[in-house]
């Protein structure tokens, strides 16, 4: 067991042109905070994979208000270290993800708004107990300077925090087979770890995975009271006078509480008081909880079925991610039907419907012709969600309210002259052509019989609709 520690030294605009002046948006002042996530191994993990080695959130930093004329300084940062306790062995190789978050303090709907400003991901090798490692990383136009280290928490020592130490029983040397616990020369390596479940009160071991019983106890895990009080044949820490095993260590000897938990004895057992961020009988369960406020953008923190289980965030519509940190383009889901236009207003989704459709998602197909009278004898034709008028001759437009000039499109071919008529139009064809639109040439032996103009109309007369 141990703790990974991260110290942020500075976060600010990187060198070069185009560097941002301020982390805040135009909406007003903001402040920064950081999230660190540790994943085991050096393999490229999926972005959404859990922070299996642990995660931590910093406190919020001081409020930053941009001074337009002043040079952009290093930004005010939260105080203190970010600490990520780890329960098991330190893996040595790990992925370090540091996120810089911005909390906008302007007049936001629903309170402060959070957005991810920068994320750096590094794959690193690091031995526990070593010195601070320093690093500078760029994330877009931002630059982050930080140091980090992994340290073991007693009784664990070593580069992986797997060796256990405890105070020497004698001042001069360690017990048989146990080496001094460097660098703690006044401590010794602890006895090996017994078989899982071996009774803390009634069992002991000389080799890893063993479980040997003190007098009066039996069974594979030394949890069954023995009917005999004979000491013969038993070996182990013994009294020189009787040859029998003496009572073993108290339930708190060797501190069964992991991750810096403190042990207190209770009748026949023990109780661990765990540091913040750890839970469980032996403080073996680690992680951020709802008390740390991990859900952003109005997300609701929902604990697991019991206090030891991890939280989840239920995100408001429009946000997703394990901490509701990602804004969703809700219009990408195409919620508006029948060709409606989607508008994401932040606090709500709106659909602007095409003609002939209505409803919050344009799901209702209106009777296209209902209440849509076509003027001047036109008839309404439904289709495609928008009504259309089929107009009487001589009228046009959406509702047949516009007078139409049937000759405007020059329908008579080959120089024929067009005459508007109550029933449409008539073409007076040039010599040598015939047909309703003068489209056919007259055969050489044929004669054009069309009149120069229809009765009652002269070329050039204003249109008259009878």
């Amino acid at each position: 067991a141990g703790v990974f520690e991260l110290q942020i030294h500075s976060f600010g605009p990187g060198p070069g042109p185009g560097a941002p002046r301020s982390p805040c948006s135009a909406r007003g002042p903001c402040r920064l905070f950081f999230r660190v996530c540790l994943k085991p191994g050096l393999s490229e993990e999926a972005a959404e994979s859990p922070c299996a080695l642990g995660a931590a959130l910093s406190a919020r930093g001081p409020v930053y208000t941009e001074q337009p004329e002043a040079p952009a300084p290093d930004l005010p940062l939260p105080n203190g270290l970010l600490q990520v306790p780890f329960r098991d062995a330190w893996p040595g190789t790990f992925s370090l993800i540091i996120e810089t978050w911005r909390e906008e303090l302007g007049d936001q709907i629903g309170g402060p708004a959070w957005s991810l400003l920068a994320r750096v991901t590094r794959r690193r090798r690091l031995a526990a107990g070593g010195p601070w490692a320093r690093d500078i990383q760029r994330a877009g136009a931002w630059e982050l300077r930080f140091s980090y280290r992994a340290r073991c928490e007693l009784p664990a020592v070593g580069t992986a925090c797997t060796r256990l130490c405890r105070p020497r029983s004698a001042p001069s040397r360690c017990g048989p087979g146990l080496r001094p616990c460097a660098p703690l020369e006044d401590e010794c390596e602890a006895p090996p770890v017994c078989r899982a479940g071996c009774s803390l009160e009634h069992g002991f071991c000389e080799q890893p995975g063993e479980c040997r019983c003190l007098e009066g106890w039996t069974g594979p895990l030394c949890m069954v009271p023995a009917s005999t009080s004979s000491c013969l044949g038993l070996r182990g820490p013994s009294s020189a006078t009787t040859g029998c095993l003496v009572p073993g260590p108290g339930p708190c000897d060797g501190n069964p509480c992991a991750n810096g938990g403190s042990c207190s004895e209770t009748p026949g057992s023990f109780e661990c008081t765990c540091p913040r961020g750890f839970y469980g009988l032996r403080c073996e369960v680690s992680g951020v909880t709802c008390a740390d406020g991990p859900c952003f953008n109005g997300g609701l923190c929902v604990g697991g079925a019991d206090p030891d289980s991890a939280y989840i965030c239920h995100c408001p519509p429009g946000f997703q991610g394990s901490n509701c940190e990602k804004r969703v383009d809700r219009c990408s889901l195409q919620p508006c039907r029948n060709g409606g236009l989607c508008l994401d207003l932040g606090h709500a989704l709106r659909c602007r419907c095409r003609a002939g459709f209505a409803g919050p998602r344009c799901e209702h197909n209106l009777d296209d012709c209902a209440g849509r009278a076509c003027a001047n004898g036109g008839t309404c034709v439904e289709g495609g969600g928008a009504h259309r008028c089929s107009c009487a001759l001589g009228f046009g437009g959406r509702d047949c309210r516009e007078r139409a000039d049937p000759c405007a499109a020059r329908p008579c071919a080959h120089g024929g002259r067009c005459y508007a008529h109550f029933s449409g139009l008539v073409c007076a064809c040039a010599p040598g052509y015939m047909g309703s639109r003068c489209e056919f040439p007259v055969h050489p032996d044929g004669v054009s019989a069309l009149p120069a103009a229809p009765p009652g109309l002269r070329p050039g007369d204003p249109q008259r609709y009878l």
Epitope: G298, C301, H314, P316, P317, P335, A348, P360
Partner: antibody
Framework: QVQLQESGPGLVKPSETLSLTCTVS????????WSWIRQPPGKGLEWIGY???????NYNPSLKSRVTISVDTSKNQFSLKLSSVTAADTAVYYC????????????WGQGTLVTVSS | EIVLTQSPGTLSLSPGERVTLSCRAS???????LAWYQQRPGQAPRLLIY???SRATGIPDRFSGSGSGTDFTLTISRLEPEDFAVYYC?????????FGGGTKLEIK
């Protein structure tokens, strides 16, 4: 503007299941979380649980073993079922929409009184 | 769960007066995820304030909210006759969602 209307029997016998429906108008049920809250006569408000259109639910632990909230997007309705009722479940039951900027309640139905009595 | 305690339970005041209602949480309410509601007799509650200090749509500016952490207040700068009702606070930081016991504002 979203409007909500509770419906269901006003009298339920002890040990039976209370069933209420909330009909949503003026908005799509697919846009919000939807919740039930109750208020015993002369007392304060108690959150029962909520449902999202996708089916995600979350219930008050004090009622979890007896509560089911479900949603019917085709009818723009969501419903509450509370089993094994006793006189202590007598209350005005409200349906409400949860805001899009956080889990508070921006629109409420007018409430319906459910009495548990034999 | 977060327990919200409202005080006082009942308050007798006259129209025109200024009033401050208190809501105290048993644990820190992160991100100021706290709302206030007004409930008039025989009516459903109505949202007044969310995010501890943001007024809901259509709420008069005589209503204001403040506070953070575990202590929150609702202030009505000048009481109108229609303001005499019961006021509830609600946290939405973590599940289960919880309400305060309410403060009843009655006419003196």
């Amino acid at each position: 503007q979203v409007q909500l209307q509770e419906s269901g029997p006003g009298l339920v016998k002890p040990s039976e299941t209370l069933s209420l429906t909330c009909t949503v108008s003026g908005g799509s049920i697919s846009s919000y979380y939807w919740s039930w809250i109750r208020q015993p006569p002369g007392k304060g408000l108690e959150w029962i649980g909520y449902v999202y259109y996708s089916g995600t639910t979350n219930y008050n632990p004090s009622l979890k073993s007896r509560v089911t909230i479900s949603v019917d997007t085709s009818k723009n309705q969501f419903s509450l079922k509370l089993s094994s009722v006793t006189a202590a479940d007598t209350a005005v039951y409200y349906c409400a929409s949860i805001a899009v900027t956080g889990f508070y309640f921006d629109y409420w139905g007018q409430g319906t009184l459910v009495t548990v009595s034999s | 769960e977060i327990v919200l305690t409202q005080s006082p339970g009942t308050l007798s005041l006259s129209p025109g007066e200024r009033v401050t209602l208190s809501c105290r949480a048993s644990q820190r309410v992160n991100n100021n995820y706290l709302a206030w509601y007004q409930q008039r007799p025989g009516q459903a509650p109505r949202l007044l304030i969310y995010g501890a200090s943001s007024r809901a749509t259509g709420i008069p500016d005589r209503f204001s909210g403040s506070g953070s952490g575990t202590d929150f207040t609702l202030t009505i700068s000048r009481l109108e006759p229609e303001d005499f009702a019961v006021y509830y606070c609600q946290q939405y930081d973590r599940s289960p969602l919880t309400f305060g016991g309410g403060t009843k504002l009655e006419i003196k």
